[in-house]
Every structure is written in structure tokens, then in C-alpha cells.
């Protein structure tokens, strides 16, 4: 059986949209599928790689690579989006391309970044882990680490940094899919809101879905012990 809830939820573009949340109900009146997975049910994506889920993650990364920071012109906030989800009238889409990006390395002004910008994350202002020396962040935002410490200045002078962030990665459904959403939308979809991250590529949703012991490699499911747990 399915339980359908519909609600008007604020989406990334800044417009309210009627959204459906479909919950698979337990036929025997018991825990939901997500709870059963957390309790150690035999769920193959937690035991070994699932091709469908792998393709979903790759597709999400491809989209994220092309994203930019959508900054509302009225200073009400910013959110990482695709160009199509950033209003041409009410917002500014900050996306590095051609010569608009910062240099890859402070000491070499030649090669410029083309992947980015990312709301509230920039290799020029992150102090931990710093983008320098042998640890320069790649020109692919899906390979950026989580910045745990920003430079101590209140204002950076960068549009995508000096804005109030409105969306973060949200892990939705048992398939471990991720979307950058408002907290409101994430809660409605019964997702897990990652307050610490700026990009979906920085979180491992399947690890969150599976629970129990974290995967040794967050990209590779290894909970074969589920075969004995259930």
C-alpha cells in the first residue's frame, strides 16, 4: 500500500510547488522500509554495489559539475542550482567559465577554474583543508572536500560567499539519491539534511540509508554481515 501526502513546498527557484511524498506502507503494520534497512534487513544495495544506484550517483555528479551558485538579488539568500532553477529576473547565477574563474593556484595565475562557483565554498577562502601546494583542489567541484574552517573575515567580496545559504544536500529515499534543497523540502520528503556540506558529492547518502557500521570506503557498500543479521 502507498500513503501519499501533498504539500506546497518552497523549491530552489523560489516558487512554491505542490509536491507529493509517497511512502510505501508496511503491509503487516510495522516499521517502514527505511527503518527495516536501518535495523539490518537484507537490502542488497547495502551489501554490494548496485548498478542502478551507481548510475544515479554518476548522473547526479554530472549535473552537479555543471551547477552554479544562485544568488537572490534581494539578498534573501543563495542556493546551489542548475542554471534552469535560477531565476533570470530575481537572481544572479554565479558560474565560472572561460576567464571568469579564479586561478587554480595563487602562485600560478595561468590556469583558471571553470568548475564552480559553489555557494559558501571557495578555494581562496577555505583554510581547512587549504587549497595549496600539493593539495590544490581540482577543477571539478564534485571532487572538492568539505571545508571545515573558513577564513575569519565576515565579508569576502565574492557574491557566492557573502550570502545566506538556503539549501544543502538532502538524502532522499532508500535509493540514496541526493538533492540540494531547502530544509523545508528535505523535511517534507523525510530526508536527511546535511548541515555540514555544500555539495551532494560531499555526502554519501547510501551510507546514511544503510546505517549500522559505516562502509570502509563510503563509495563501496560492504555490509555482507546483513546476511546473518536478518
Amino acid at each position: 500500500a502507498q500513503h501519499v501526502t501533498t504539500q506546497l513546498v518552497l523549491r530552489n527557484k523560489g516558487v512554491y510547488e505542490s509536491v507529493k511524498y509517497i511512502q510505501q506502507e508496511n503491509f503487516w503494520i510495522g516499521p517502514s522500509s527505511i527503518d527495516l534497512i536501518h535495523l539490518g534487513a537484507k537490502f542488497s544495495p547495502c551489501i554490494r554495489k548496485d548498478q542502478q544506484i551507481e548510475q544515479l550517483v554518476l548522473r547526479e555528479r554530472d549535473l552537479e559539475r555543471d551547477s552554479g551558485c544562485c544568488v537572490q538579488n534581494d539578498h534573501s539568500g543563495c542556493i546551489q542550482t542548475q542554471r534552469k532553477d535560477c531565476s533570470e529576473t530575481l537572481a544572479t547565477f554565479v558560474k565560472w567559465q572561460d576567464d571568469t574563474g579564479p586561478p587554480m593556484d595563487k602562485s600560478d595565475l595561468g590556469q583558471k577554474r571553470t568548475s564552480g562557483a559553489v555557494c559558501h565554498q571557495d578555494p581562496r577562502t577555505c583554510e581547512e583543508p587549504a587549497s595549496s601546494g600539493a593539495h590544490i583542489w581540482p577543477d571539478d567541484i564534485t571532487k572538492w572536500p568539505i571545508c571545515t574552517e573558513q577564513a575569519k573575515s565576515n565579508r569576502t567580496g565574492f557574491l557566492h560567499m557573502d550570502c545566506q545559504i538556503k539549501g544543502r544536500p538532502c538524502c532522499i529515499s532508500t535509493k540514496g539519491s541526493c538533492e540540494i534543497t531547502t530544509r523545508e523540502y528535505c523535511e517534507f520528503m523525510h530526508g536527511y539534511f546535511h548541515e555540514e556540506a555544500t555539495l551532494c558529492s560531499q555526502v554519501h547518502c547510501l551510507d546514511k540509508v544503510c546505517g549500522l557500521l559505516p562502509f570502509l570506503n563510503p563509495e563501496v557498500p560492504d555490509q555482507f554481515y546483513r546476511l546473518w543479521l536478518s
Epitope: 506546497l8 512554491y16 510547488e17 534581494d74 534552469k84 533570470e88 529576473t89 530575481l90
Partner: antibody, heavy 116, light 107 residues
Framework: QVQLQQSGAELVKPGASVKISCKAS????????MNWVKQRPGKGLEWIGQ????????KYNGKFKNKATLTADKSSSTAYMQFSSLTSEDSAVYFC?????????WGLGTLVTVSA | DVQITQSPSYLAVSPGETITINCRAS??????LAWYQEKPGKTNKLLIY???TSQSGVPSRFSGSGSGTDFTLTISSLEPEDFAMYYC?????????FGGGTKLEIK
């Protein structure tokens, strides 16, 4: 400058379908939402839906979901709207308009007359 | 869907006067209301969005105000070219909806 050139007036029979076009120029067609708006005399404006030519994503007004089909051809920078099972209620001027939340650029409209 | 009630539907005034057109939403739409001008043989023109933000190139005599459910378009010192049809549109939620229009004519 941005221009939206709409196809000419159509006279169609009840029950038939009609496909009208909107050719865009002066901007990157793939990067902006295209909307369709209906105007009947004395009835004001009604938003039908919008399409993002870059990936074909669409949003529809529920009222027109089974009536209108929005498509876009990136190679010719043209947006299309097909209206099916036409009745006299569908006689109207149909506008294409660029924008996501508000409509900055409009076409001049296409008059569709449904008559036996 | 959000219903938008626009008033008056018809207005006849003289050039140089100041007029106001009102739009009322059936529910709270925050500040997200736009105003358009329609003239025969010309493409529709966006005047104001987000309640009070003027679209670039729009003369300063056009101004918008309001939030929540009540909004106003004010045109001060009417010029001959301002006599036209005006519509409001909410852009707070899907589906976008329009007011019924106000016809502004020369007295």
C-alpha cells in the same frame, strides 16, 4: 535584441488539434524557460505552462495538463505548443513569453479560432 | 490555485493625473506580484516584479507596493502613452495566475 516570432492565425475544426510555434532569436534559446499564455476576450490571461529547452523539462498548469503539450527544438530555437481535442473554449490568442517566474519578453500572439 | 482580484476593471482619467490599480490575492503570496502593460499591436511589457522592483527601462512614474495579499500599482503624472491595459500576476507559486485586467482610458 530578444525577439519571439509566433506562427500565423489558425482556423481549426472542433475535435482537431493545432500546433503553434514561437521562434526565438537574440539569446541562447537553451538557457531560458519559455512560457505559453492564453487570452480569451473578456477572460484575461491564463498561464498554460513552461518548458526549459536545455533539457525539455516542463511545468504545466493542472487545468491544461491533458490539453497542451509543450516541446522545443534547440536546433531551430523554436518552441511549440500543441493543443488537442479543440472546443470553442479553446478559441483564443496564445502568447509565448520568455521567463521563469515573470515574463520579460513576449511574442505578439497567435489567434486560434475553433469553428465548424 | 491563487485567485487574483484586480480592481477597477475600467478607469477613465486625464493625462497628468495620478492613478492606482489594486490587486488582491486569495492567500498570502509574500511580495511576489508582477505588473504588465498591454497595448494593441505591441508586445506586452513587464513593469514591476516582486511587488516593488522596477524592470530596467521602465519610467520612474510607475511604482508598485504591497505584500501578503494586497498590492497596488501607482502611475503618477499620466502620459498619453500610459493609456493601455494593465494586468497583475502572482509569481509566488505554481500555477502562475493573473488578475482580470484594468483598462485605462483617456477621459
Amino acid at each position: 535584441q530578444v525577439q519571439l516570432q509566433q506562427s500565423g492565425a489558425e482556423l481549426v475544426k472542433p475535435g482537431a488539434s493545432v500546433k503553434i510555434s514561437c521562434k526565438a532569436s537574440g539569446y541562447t534559446f537553451s538557457n531560458y524557460w519559455m512560457n505559453w499564455v492564453k487570452q480569451r476576450p473578456g477572460k484575461g490571461l491564463e498561464w498554460i505552462g513552461q518548458i526549459y529547452p536545455g533539457d525539455g523539462d516542463t511545468k504545466y498548469n493542472g487545468k491544461f495538463k491533458n490539453k497542451a503539450t509543450l516541446t522545443a527544438d534547440k536546433s531551430s530555437s523554436t518552441a511549440y505548443m500543441q493543443f488537442s481535442s479543440l472546443t470553442s473554449e479553446d478559441s483564443a490568442v496564445y502568447f509565448c513569453a520568455r521567463g521563469d517566474l515573470v515574463f520579460v519578453y513576449w511574442g505578439l500572439g497567435t489567434l486560434v479560432t475553433v469553428s465548424a | 490555485d491563487v485567485q487574483i482580484t484586480q480592481s477597477p476593471s475600467y478607469l477613465a482619467v486625464s493625462p497628468g493625473e495620478t492613478i492606482t490599480i489594486n490587486c488582491r490575492a486569495s492567500k498570502n503570496i509574500r511580495k511576489y506580484l508582477a505588473w504588465y502593460q498591454e497595448k494593441p499591436g505591441k508586445t506586452n511589457k513587464l513593469l514591476i516584479y516582486s511587488g516593488s522592483t522596477s524592470q530596467s527601462g521602465v519610467p520612474s512614474r510607475f511604482s508598485g507596493s504591497g505584500s501578503g495579499t494586497d498590492f497596488t500599482l501607482t502611475i503618477s503624472s499620466l502620459e498619453p502613452e500610459d493609456f493601455a491595459m494593465y494586468y497583475c500576476q502572482q509569481h509566488n507559486e505554481y500555477p502562475y495566475t493573473f488578475g482580470g485586467g484594468t483598462k485605462l482610458e483617456i477621459k
